[in-house]
Amino acid sequence: LVPHLGDREKRDSVCPQGKYIHPQNNSICCTKCHKGTYLYNDCPGPGQDTDCRECESGSFTASENHLRHCLSCSKCRKEMGQVEISSCTVDRDTVCGCRKNQYRHYWSENLFQCFNCSLCLNGTVHLSCQEKQNTVCTCHAGFFLRENECVSCSNCKKSLECTKLCLPQIENVKGTEDSGTT
């Protein structure tokens, strides 16, 4: 099966790499603009220069292109705990990340929030905290994992998933409760 090409891809594929078809004259291939620049005017004819201009402050293009406008620089989202790793330049978007001992949780493809790495108190570190994944903890006996924290089995209610992990403790508690005098 031949993949479906959009109009722009179709037009570009007629020209050699690094060039694009003139929008008003499909017999002319114009040179694309370098990253960090955008298309101001198409080339007037074959072998003539494309008029490319440098992106203004606050905008960028990260690859060769024939865009009429540069792309707006991303802003790091403070409310999500994000910090700026590197600022935007004409040829590279802002890079946002998290502070030390934090990881990124992606709520969607283009939205992440920074959270503190779990310390595995009352447990051991099974897998260390990574850039995009929290620490994986293994809890000590008498504790169960809830929201990535090791919680005492005394907080385990019968209806919760922890009953399997805390079964001996629950039996003990039940036994103690049932051993009242009649």
Partner: nanobody, 119 residues
């Protein structure tokens, strides 16, 4: 005690509009980033939009950008979601919530309001 109560859902035709509201109490609303998430039948929770305390630079999921508008009235402790040009794929239960702080789960979110887009 934190309370969040959504309202404004209902049945609407494609390309129609709805305005959801979320009445908040039990915390300092004006200090919190507020979130709208939704859950379509048989699907997981999807982040729709969020708005910081000062209402500056709200976030929108690509699927709703240009159609939905999030806003808040800090004097009324109320969050809003104006939904225009509704599509069948917007059918879901819509929840408002406080931006999670401890980890990637919602400690505080409402009971939800059902939005059905159908002709």
């Amino acid at each position: 005690e934190v309370r969040l109560l959504e309202s404004g859902g209902g049945l609407v035709q494609p390309e129609g509009s709805l305005r959801l509201s979320c009445a908040a109490s039990g915390f300092t609303f004006a200090h919190e980033t507020m979130v709208w998430v939704r859950q379509a039948p048989g699907k997981g929770l999807e982040w729709v939009s969020h708005i910081p305390p000062d209402s500056q630079d709200p976030f929108y999921a690509d699927s709703v950008k240009g159609r939905f508008t999030i806003s808040r009235d800090n004097s009324k402790n109320t969050l809003y979601l104006q939904m225009n040009s509704l599509r069948a794929e917007d059918t879901a239960v819509y929840y408002c919530g406080l931006l999670p702080k401890r980890g990637p789960w919602f400690d505080y979110r409402g009971q939800g309001t059902l939005v059905t887009v159908s002709s």
